[in-house]
Protein backbone atom coordinates (compact mmCIF):
# COMPACT_ATOMS: atom_id res chain seq x y z
CA UNK A 1 0.00 0.00 0.00
CA UNK A 2 1.21 3.48 -0.87
CA UNK A 3 -0.89 5.25 1.79
CA UNK A 4 -3.97 4.76 3.96
CA UNK A 5 -6.26 5.78 1.11
CA UNK A 6 -4.90 2.73 -0.76
CA UNK A 7 -5.55 0.61 2.31
CA UNK A 8 -9.13 1.90 2.54
CA UNK A 9 -9.80 1.32 -1.16
CA UNK A 10 -8.63 -2.27 -0.79
CA UNK A 11 -11.50 -2.89 1.63
CA UNK A 12 -9.54 -2.62 4.87
CA UNK A 13 -11.66 0.02 6.59
CA UNK A 14 -10.74 -0.47 10.24
CA UNK A 15 -8.50 2.14 11.85
CA UNK A 16 -5.13 0.82 12.96
CA UNK A 17 -1.51 0.30 12.02
CA UNK A 18 -0.74 -0.77 8.47
CA UNK A 19 2.47 -1.31 6.54
CA UNK A 20 3.03 1.20 3.75
CA UNK A 21 5.65 1.09 1.00
CA UNK A 22 7.74 4.05 -0.11
CA UNK A 23 6.98 5.21 -3.66
CA UNK A 24 9.09 3.43 -6.32
CA UNK A 25 10.83 1.38 -3.63
CA UNK A 26 10.59 -1.74 -1.52
CA UNK A 27 11.30 0.20 1.69
CA UNK A 28 8.45 0.02 4.17
CA UNK A 29 7.13 2.01 7.11
CA UNK A 30 4.34 1.48 9.59
CA UNK A 31 1.64 4.13 9.82
CA UNK A 32 -1.60 4.64 11.70
CA UNK A 33 -4.58 4.79 9.36
CA UNK A 34 -7.62 6.76 10.47
CA UNK A 35 -10.55 5.15 8.68
CA UNK A 36 -13.30 7.09 10.49
CA UNK A 37 -12.56 10.81 10.23
CA UNK A 38 -14.29 12.48 7.29
CA UNK A 39 -14.70 9.32 5.22
CA UNK A 40 -11.43 7.66 6.26
CA UNK A 41 -8.27 6.99 4.30
CA UNK A 42 -6.12 9.34 6.38
CA UNK A 43 -2.41 8.62 6.88
CA UNK A 44 -1.40 9.95 10.29
CA UNK A 45 1.94 11.75 10.16
CA UNK A 46 2.04 13.14 13.71
CA UNK A 47 0.29 12.62 17.02
CA UNK A 48 0.66 14.20 20.45
CA UNK A 49 -1.58 13.09 23.29
CA UNK A 50 0.14 12.42 26.60
CA UNK A 51 3.76 13.52 26.61
CA UNK A 52 5.06 9.95 26.58
CA UNK A 53 7.47 10.52 23.67
CA UNK A 54 10.38 12.98 23.54
CA UNK A 55 10.05 15.19 20.44
CA UNK A 56 13.39 16.97 20.89
CA UNK A 57 15.04 14.75 18.31
CA UNK A 58 17.75 14.97 15.67
CA UNK A 59 17.40 15.65 11.96
CA UNK A 60 17.91 11.98 11.20
CA UNK A 61 15.21 10.92 13.65
CA UNK A 62 12.71 13.34 12.14
CA UNK A 63 13.77 12.09 8.72
CA UNK A 64 13.02 8.43 9.42
CA UNK A 65 10.36 8.87 12.08
CA UNK A 66 10.06 7.93 15.73
CA UNK A 67 7.56 6.88 18.35
CA UNK A 68 4.74 4.36 18.03
CA UNK A 69 2.12 4.90 15.30
CA UNK A 70 -0.64 3.90 17.72
CA UNK A 71 0.43 6.64 20.14
CA UNK A 72 2.70 9.67 20.03
CA UNK A 73 4.87 9.65 16.94
CA UNK A 74 6.34 11.39 13.91
CA UNK A 75 5.95 9.34 10.75
CA UNK A 76 9.07 10.61 9.03
CA UNK A 77 9.88 13.52 6.71
CA UNK A 78 11.44 11.36 4.00
CA UNK A 79 8.39 9.16 3.55
CA UNK A 80 6.00 12.14 3.68
CA UNK A 81 8.12 14.09 1.20
CA UNK A 82 8.24 11.23 -1.28
CA UNK A 83 4.55 10.48 -0.89
CA UNK A 84 3.31 14.06 -1.26
CA UNK A 85 5.37 14.63 -4.39
CA UNK A 86 3.62 11.76 -6.20
CA UNK A 87 0.19 13.43 -6.28
CA UNK A 88 -1.77 16.19 -4.55
CA UNK A 89 -2.45 15.61 -0.86
CA UNK A 90 -4.56 17.50 1.64
CA UNK A 91 -3.37 18.01 5.21
CA UNK A 92 -5.73 17.99 8.16
CA UNK A 93 -4.51 19.14 11.55
CA UNK A 94 -6.79 18.24 14.43
CA UNK A 95 -6.31 20.01 17.75
CA UNK A 96 -7.68 19.60 21.28
CA UNK A 97 -7.30 22.00 24.17
CA UNK A 98 -7.51 21.29 27.90
CA UNK A 99 -11.04 22.65 28.19
CA UNK A 100 -12.58 20.00 25.94
CA UNK A 101 -12.67 22.08 22.75
CA UNK A 102 -11.63 20.73 19.37
CA UNK A 103 -10.66 22.53 16.18
CA UNK A 104 -9.03 21.75 12.87
CA UNK A 105 -7.12 23.34 10.03
CA UNK A 106 -7.43 21.82 6.57
CA UNK A 107 -5.03 22.67 3.76
CA UNK A 108 -6.18 21.90 0.22
CA UNK A 109 -2.67 21.18 -1.00
CA UNK A 110 0.30 20.01 1.06
CA UNK A 111 3.71 18.72 0.18
CA UNK A 112 7.23 18.64 1.54
CA UNK A 113 10.29 19.40 -0.57
CA UNK A 114 13.05 16.82 -0.61
CA UNK A 115 15.80 16.63 2.00
CA UNK A 116 18.02 18.62 -0.38
CA UNK A 117 15.65 21.55 0.29
CA UNK A 118 15.36 20.80 4.01
CA UNK A 119 11.88 19.29 3.76
CA UNK A 120 10.41 22.76 3.21
CA UNK A 121 6.65 22.77 3.74
CA UNK A 122 4.26 23.95 1.02
CA UNK A 123 0.67 24.75 1.93
CA UNK A 124 -2.27 26.21 0.04
CA UNK A 125 -5.94 26.79 0.73
CA UNK A 126 -6.67 26.99 4.45
CA UNK A 127 -10.13 26.24 5.81
CA UNK A 128 -11.32 25.09 9.20
CA UNK A 129 -12.04 26.22 12.73
CA UNK A 130 -8.51 26.62 14.12
CA UNK A 131 -7.89 30.11 12.80
CA UNK A 132 -8.50 32.26 9.74
CA UNK A 133 -4.77 32.75 9.24
CA UNK A 134 -2.37 29.85 8.89
CA UNK A 135 -0.41 29.10 12.05
CA UNK A 136 2.21 27.50 9.83
CA UNK A 137 3.85 30.54 8.26
CA UNK A 138 3.32 31.13 4.57
CA UNK A 139 5.23 30.85 2.35
CA UNK A 140 6.49 27.69 3.96
CA UNK A 141 9.80 27.39 5.77
CA UNK A 142 12.51 24.78 5.91
CA UNK A 143 12.39 22.14 8.64
CA UNK A 144 14.69 22.68 11.61
CA UNK A 145 15.79 20.39 14.42
CA UNK A 146 18.10 20.79 17.41
CA UNK A 147 21.07 19.81 15.21
CA UNK A 148 19.93 21.50 11.95
CA UNK A 149 19.21 25.22 12.25
CA UNK A 150 17.34 26.22 9.08
CA UNK A 151 15.05 28.87 10.54
CA UNK A 152 14.93 32.61 9.87
CA UNK A 153 15.91 33.65 13.38
CA UNK A 154 19.32 34.71 14.66
CA UNK A 155 18.37 32.44 17.55
CA UNK A 156 18.04 28.68 17.17
CA UNK A 157 14.29 28.12 17.30
CA UNK A 158 14.42 24.35 17.64
CA UNK A 159 16.78 24.54 20.62
CA UNK A 160 14.85 27.40 22.21
CA UNK A 161 11.32 26.09 21.64
CA UNK A 162 12.21 22.36 21.48
CA UNK A 163 11.15 19.94 18.76
CA UNK A 164 11.60 19.85 15.02
CA UNK A 165 9.30 22.15 13.04
CA UNK A 166 9.01 24.47 10.05
CA UNK A 167 10.14 27.42 12.11
CA UNK A 168 10.11 30.94 10.77
CA UNK A 169 11.58 33.35 13.31
CA UNK A 170 10.22 31.46 15.21
CA UNK A 171 6.60 31.64 14.05
CA UNK A 172 3.06 31.06 15.25
CA UNK A 173 3.11 27.29 15.65
CA UNK A 174 5.05 24.33 16.92
CA UNK A 175 3.09 21.12 17.33
CA UNK A 176 6.28 19.30 18.33
CA UNK A 177 7.04 21.48 21.35
CA UNK A 178 7.25 20.49 25.00
CA UNK A 179 4.23 18.63 26.33
CA UNK A 180 2.77 20.39 29.37
CA UNK A 181 0.11 18.77 31.54
CA UNK A 182 -3.15 20.44 32.50
CA UNK A 183 -2.86 23.53 34.73
CA UNK A 184 0.78 23.89 33.66
CA UNK A 185 -0.11 24.59 30.03
CA UNK A 186 -0.43 28.38 29.99
CA UNK A 187 2.22 31.08 29.61
CA UNK A 188 4.54 28.53 28.04
CA UNK A 189 6.68 29.85 25.20
CA UNK A 190 7.97 26.39 24.23
CA UNK A 191 4.79 24.33 24.38
CA UNK A 192 2.56 22.78 21.72
CA UNK A 193 1.45 25.96 20.00
CA UNK A 194 -1.15 26.86 17.38
CA UNK A 195 -1.32 30.63 17.77
CA UNK A 196 -4.29 31.44 15.56
CA UNK A 197 -6.51 29.16 17.61
CA UNK A 198 -5.39 29.57 21.21
CA UNK A 199 -3.07 32.57 21.12
CA UNK A 200 0.33 32.94 22.74
CA UNK A 201 1.55 30.72 25.51
CA UNK A 202 -1.18 28.07 25.39
CA UNK A 203 0.10 24.50 25.13
CA UNK A 204 -2.41 22.08 23.62
CA UNK A 205 -3.58 18.75 25.02
CA UNK A 206 -3.58 16.74 21.81
CA UNK A 207 -2.75 17.13 18.13
CA UNK A 208 -2.98 14.95 15.05
CA UNK A 209 -1.61 15.70 11.60
CA UNK A 210 -2.91 13.51 8.80
CA UNK A 211 -2.82 13.48 5.01
CA UNK A 212 -5.00 12.06 2.25
CA UNK A 213 -5.00 12.29 -1.54
CA UNK A 214 -7.04 15.27 -2.73
CA UNK A 215 -9.00 13.03 -5.11
CA UNK A 216 -10.03 10.50 -2.44
Amino acid sequence: FRDCADVFRSGLTTSGIYTLTFPNSTEETKAYCDMETGGGGWTTIQRREDGSVDFQRTWKEYKVGFGNPSGEHWLGNEFVSQLTNQQRYVLKIHLRDWEGNEAYSLYEHFYLSSEEFNYRIHLKGLTGTAGKISSISQPGNDFSTKDADNDKCICKCSQMLTGGWWFDACGPSNLNGMYYPQRQNTNKFNGIKWYYWKGSGYSLKATTMMIRPADF
Epitope: H109, H122, K124, G125, L126, K132, Q138, P139, G140
Partner: antibody, heavy 115, light 107 residues
Framework: SEHLVESGGGLVKPGGSLRLSCATA???????MSWVRQAPGKGLEWVGS????????YLNTKFIGRFTISRDDSKNTLYLQMNSLRAEDTAVYYC?????????WGQGTLVTVSS | AIYMHQEPSSLSASVGDRVTITCHGS??????VAWYQQKPGKAPKLLIF???FKVYEVPSRFSGSGSHEDYTLTISSLQPEDFATYYC?????????FGHGTKVEIK
Protein backbone atom coordinates in the same frame (compact mmCIF):
# COMPACT_ATOMS: atom_id res chain seq x y z
CA SER B 1 5.29 42.14 -0.56
CA GLU B 2 7.08 40.28 -3.33
CA HIS B 3 4.29 37.69 -3.10
CA LEU B 4 1.71 40.07 -4.59
CA VAL B 5 2.93 42.43 -7.31
CA GLU B 6 0.58 44.80 -9.10
CA SER B 7 1.25 46.30 -12.52
CA GLY B 8 -0.59 48.04 -15.33
CA GLY B 9 -1.17 51.42 -13.72
CA GLY B 10 -0.46 54.68 -15.50
CA LEU B 11 -1.99 57.78 -16.99
CA VAL B 12 -5.27 57.37 -18.86
CA LYS B 13 -7.76 59.88 -20.24
CA PRO B 14 -11.31 60.14 -18.86
CA GLY B 15 -13.54 57.58 -20.57
CA GLY B 16 -10.55 55.34 -21.22
CA SER B 17 -9.83 51.78 -20.09
CA LEU B 18 -7.05 50.07 -18.17
CA ARG B 19 -6.36 46.51 -17.09
CA LEU B 20 -4.44 46.04 -13.86
CA SER B 21 -2.63 42.80 -13.11
CA CYS B 22 -1.51 41.27 -9.85
CA ALA B 23 1.08 38.50 -10.01
CA THR B 24 0.45 36.23 -7.04
CA ALA B 25 2.61 33.68 -5.29
CA UNK B 26 1.36 30.21 -5.98
CA UNK B 27 0.26 29.65 -2.38
CA UNK B 28 -2.67 32.04 -3.01
CA UNK B 29 -4.19 29.60 -5.53
CA UNK B 30 -7.04 28.54 -3.23
CA UNK B 31 -7.67 31.94 -1.65
CA UNK B 32 -10.20 34.68 -2.28
CA MET B 33 -8.47 37.77 -3.62
CA SER B 34 -9.58 41.40 -3.56
CA TRP B 35 -8.77 44.77 -5.03
CA VAL B 36 -8.69 47.75 -2.66
CA ARG B 37 -8.01 51.32 -3.79
CA GLN B 38 -6.86 54.52 -2.14
CA ALA B 39 -7.29 57.97 -3.68
CA PRO B 40 -4.42 60.40 -3.04
CA GLY B 41 -4.52 61.56 0.59
CA LYS B 42 -7.75 59.63 1.20
CA GLY B 43 -8.85 56.44 2.90
CA LEU B 44 -9.19 52.84 1.74
CA GLU B 45 -12.04 51.60 -0.43
CA TRP B 46 -12.84 47.98 -1.23
CA VAL B 47 -13.41 47.46 -4.96
CA GLY B 48 -14.33 43.78 -5.11
CA SER B 49 -13.24 40.19 -4.67
CA UNK B 50 -13.07 36.88 -6.50
CA UNK B 51 -13.14 33.28 -5.31
CA UNK B 52 -10.37 30.74 -6.03
CA UNK B 53 -11.84 29.30 -9.23
CA UNK B 54 -13.29 32.63 -10.27
CA UNK B 55 -16.83 31.30 -9.96
CA UNK B 56 -17.91 33.83 -7.31
CA UNK B 57 -17.30 37.53 -7.77
CA TYR B 58 -18.36 40.34 -5.48
CA LEU B 59 -18.12 43.90 -6.72
CA ASN B 60 -18.76 47.03 -4.70
CA THR B 61 -22.06 48.21 -6.18
CA LYS B 62 -20.59 51.61 -7.10
CA PHE B 63 -18.32 49.89 -9.66
CA ILE B 64 -20.84 47.55 -11.27
CA GLY B 65 -20.98 48.09 -15.01
CA ARG B 66 -17.51 49.64 -15.20
CA PHE B 67 -15.11 47.31 -13.40
CA THR B 68 -14.60 43.55 -13.79
CA ILE B 69 -12.46 41.22 -11.67
CA SER B 70 -11.00 38.00 -13.05
CA ARG B 71 -8.14 35.61 -12.38
CA ASP B 72 -6.05 33.15 -14.35
CA ASP B 73 -4.74 30.49 -11.98
CA SER B 74 -2.55 28.98 -14.69
CA LYS B 75 -0.65 32.27 -14.68
CA ASN B 76 -1.09 32.97 -10.94
CA THR B 77 -2.51 36.35 -11.89
CA LEU B 78 -5.44 38.46 -10.72
CA TYR B 79 -6.91 41.16 -12.97
CA LEU B 80 -9.00 44.32 -12.64
CA GLN B 81 -10.48 45.56 -15.91
CA MET B 82 -11.53 49.19 -15.56
CA ASN B 83 -13.65 50.89 -18.24
CA SER B 84 -15.22 54.35 -18.58
CA LEU B 85 -12.65 55.73 -16.19
CA ARG B 86 -13.31 59.01 -14.38
CA ALA B 87 -11.07 61.51 -12.64
CA GLU B 88 -12.34 60.23 -9.29
CA ASP B 89 -10.93 56.76 -10.10
CA THR B 90 -7.43 58.21 -9.66
CA ALA B 91 -5.93 56.11 -6.89
CA VAL B 92 -3.36 53.56 -5.87
CA TYR B 93 -4.87 50.12 -6.51
CA TYR B 94 -3.81 47.26 -4.26
CA CYS B 95 -4.45 43.56 -4.61
CA UNK B 96 -4.81 41.69 -1.34
CA UNK B 97 -5.57 38.25 0.00
CA UNK B 98 -9.15 38.33 1.24
CA UNK B 99 -10.08 36.48 4.41
CA UNK B 100 -12.80 39.04 5.00
CA UNK B 101 -9.96 41.15 6.31
CA UNK B 102 -6.77 41.51 4.25
CA UNK B 103 -3.61 39.91 5.58
CA UNK B 104 -1.37 40.11 2.49
CA TRP B 105 -1.08 43.22 0.34
CA GLY B 106 0.81 44.14 -2.80
CA GLN B 107 2.78 47.37 -3.04
CA GLY B 108 0.08 49.00 -5.18
CA THR B 109 -0.02 50.51 -8.68
CA LEU B 110 -0.99 54.13 -9.34
CA VAL B 111 -3.77 54.91 -11.80
CA THR B 112 -4.12 58.55 -12.85
CA VAL B 113 -7.19 59.59 -14.83
CA SER B 114 -6.64 63.00 -16.37
CA SER B 115 -7.03 64.78 -19.68
CA ALA C 1 -23.48 49.97 2.96
CA ILE C 2 -22.27 49.85 6.54
CA TYR C 3 -20.75 53.15 7.60
CA MET C 4 -17.71 52.97 9.87
CA HIS C 5 -17.41 56.17 11.90
CA GLN C 6 -13.80 56.40 13.07
CA GLU C 7 -12.60 58.88 15.70
CA PRO C 8 -10.53 60.93 16.03
CA SER C 9 -9.50 61.80 12.47
CA SER C 10 -6.10 62.82 13.81
CA LEU C 11 -4.29 63.07 17.12
CA SER C 12 -0.98 64.31 18.44
CA ALA C 13 0.79 62.20 21.02
CA SER C 14 4.20 61.65 22.55
CA VAL C 15 6.32 58.54 22.78
CA GLY C 16 5.09 56.51 25.76
CA ASP C 17 1.51 57.83 25.58
CA ARG C 18 -1.51 55.56 25.61
CA VAL C 19 -3.52 56.05 22.43
CA THR C 20 -7.12 54.97 21.82
CA ILE C 21 -8.90 55.00 18.46
CA THR C 22 -12.58 54.10 18.14
CA CYS C 23 -14.83 52.89 15.36
CA HIS C 24 -18.61 52.81 15.44
CA GLY C 25 -20.42 50.72 12.84
CA SER C 26 -23.86 51.67 11.60
CA UNK C 27 -25.02 48.12 12.33
CA UNK C 28 -24.15 45.12 14.53
CA UNK C 29 -20.79 43.72 13.36
CA UNK C 30 -20.38 40.49 15.34
CA UNK C 31 -16.72 41.38 16.08
CA UNK C 32 -15.91 41.09 12.36
CA VAL C 33 -13.67 44.12 12.55
CA ALA C 34 -10.03 44.52 11.58
CA TRP C 35 -7.47 47.25 12.22
CA TYR C 36 -4.64 48.30 9.91
CA GLN C 37 -1.58 50.53 10.16
CA GLN C 38 -0.40 52.43 7.10
CA LYS C 39 2.75 54.46 6.66
CA PRO C 40 3.24 56.96 3.80
CA GLY C 41 3.88 55.32 0.45
CA LYS C 42 3.32 51.83 1.85
CA ALA C 43 0.52 49.29 1.76
CA PRO C 44 -1.63 48.88 4.87
CA LYS C 45 -0.51 46.27 7.40
CA LEU C 46 -3.00 44.11 9.27
CA LEU C 47 -2.75 44.49 13.05
CA ILE C 48 -5.94 43.04 14.54
CA PHE C 49 -8.81 40.93 13.24
CA UNK C 50 -12.02 39.50 14.74
CA UNK C 51 -12.16 42.58 16.94
CA UNK C 52 -9.43 41.55 19.34
CA PHE C 53 -7.13 38.91 17.78
CA LYS C 54 -3.65 40.31 17.28
CA VAL C 55 -1.62 39.21 14.27
CA TYR C 56 1.31 37.13 15.51
CA GLU C 57 4.15 39.48 14.55
CA VAL C 58 2.43 42.60 15.91
CA PRO C 59 3.87 43.96 19.19
CA SER C 60 1.88 43.35 22.36
CA ARG C 61 1.35 47.09 22.93
CA PHE C 62 -1.36 46.92 20.25
CA SER C 63 -4.72 45.54 21.33
CA GLY C 64 -8.25 45.50 20.03
CA SER C 65 -11.54 45.30 21.90
CA GLY C 66 -15.22 45.89 21.40
CA SER C 67 -18.52 44.25 20.51
CA HIS C 68 -21.79 44.95 18.75
CA GLU C 69 -21.22 48.25 16.90
CA ASP C 70 -18.32 49.72 18.88
CA TYR C 71 -14.65 48.78 18.55
CA THR C 72 -11.40 50.18 19.88
CA LEU C 73 -7.73 49.99 18.96
CA THR C 74 -5.39 50.76 21.83
CA ILE C 75 -1.65 51.38 21.71
CA SER C 76 -0.55 51.05 25.34
CA SER C 77 2.75 52.88 25.02
CA LEU C 78 3.35 54.70 21.76
CA GLN C 79 6.70 54.03 20.10
CA PRO C 80 8.45 56.14 17.42
CA GLU C 81 7.62 53.57 14.73
CA ASP C 82 3.88 53.76 15.57
CA PHE C 83 3.39 57.21 14.04
CA ALA C 84 1.17 56.32 11.08
CA THR C 85 -2.44 56.29 9.91
CA TYR C 86 -4.77 53.63 11.33
CA TYR C 87 -7.93 52.27 9.71
CA CYS C 88 -10.73 50.06 10.95
CA UNK C 89 -12.63 47.78 8.57
CA UNK C 90 -15.80 45.72 8.87
CA UNK C 91 -16.13 42.43 7.02
CA UNK C 92 -19.49 41.33 8.36
CA UNK C 93 -21.34 42.59 5.28
CA UNK C 94 -20.63 43.29 1.63
CA UNK C 95 -19.45 45.74 0.58
CA UNK C 96 -16.58 45.66 3.05
CA UNK C 97 -16.07 49.17 4.37
CA PHE C 98 -13.29 51.07 6.11
CA GLY C 99 -13.24 53.94 8.55
CA HIS C 100 -11.82 57.21 7.25
CA GLY C 101 -8.61 56.75 9.18
CA THR C 102 -6.83 58.24 12.19
CA LYS C 103 -3.49 59.95 11.65
CA VAL C 104 -1.27 59.62 14.72
CA GLU C 105 1.28 62.43 14.71
CA ILE C 106 4.17 63.40 16.96
CA LYS C 107 3.30 66.09 19.51
Amino acid sequence: SEHLVESGGGLVKPGGSLRLSCATADFFEYDDMSWVRQAPGKGLEWVGSISPKGDHKYLNTKFIGRFTISRDDSKNTLYLQMNSLRAEDTAVYYCARDVGFFDWWGQGTLVTVSS
Amino acid sequence: AIYMHQEPSSLSASVGDRVTITCHGSYWLNSEVAWYQQKPGKAPKLLIFDGDFKVYEVPSRFSGSGSHEDYTLTISSLQPEDFATYYCQQYRYHPYTFGHGTKVEIK
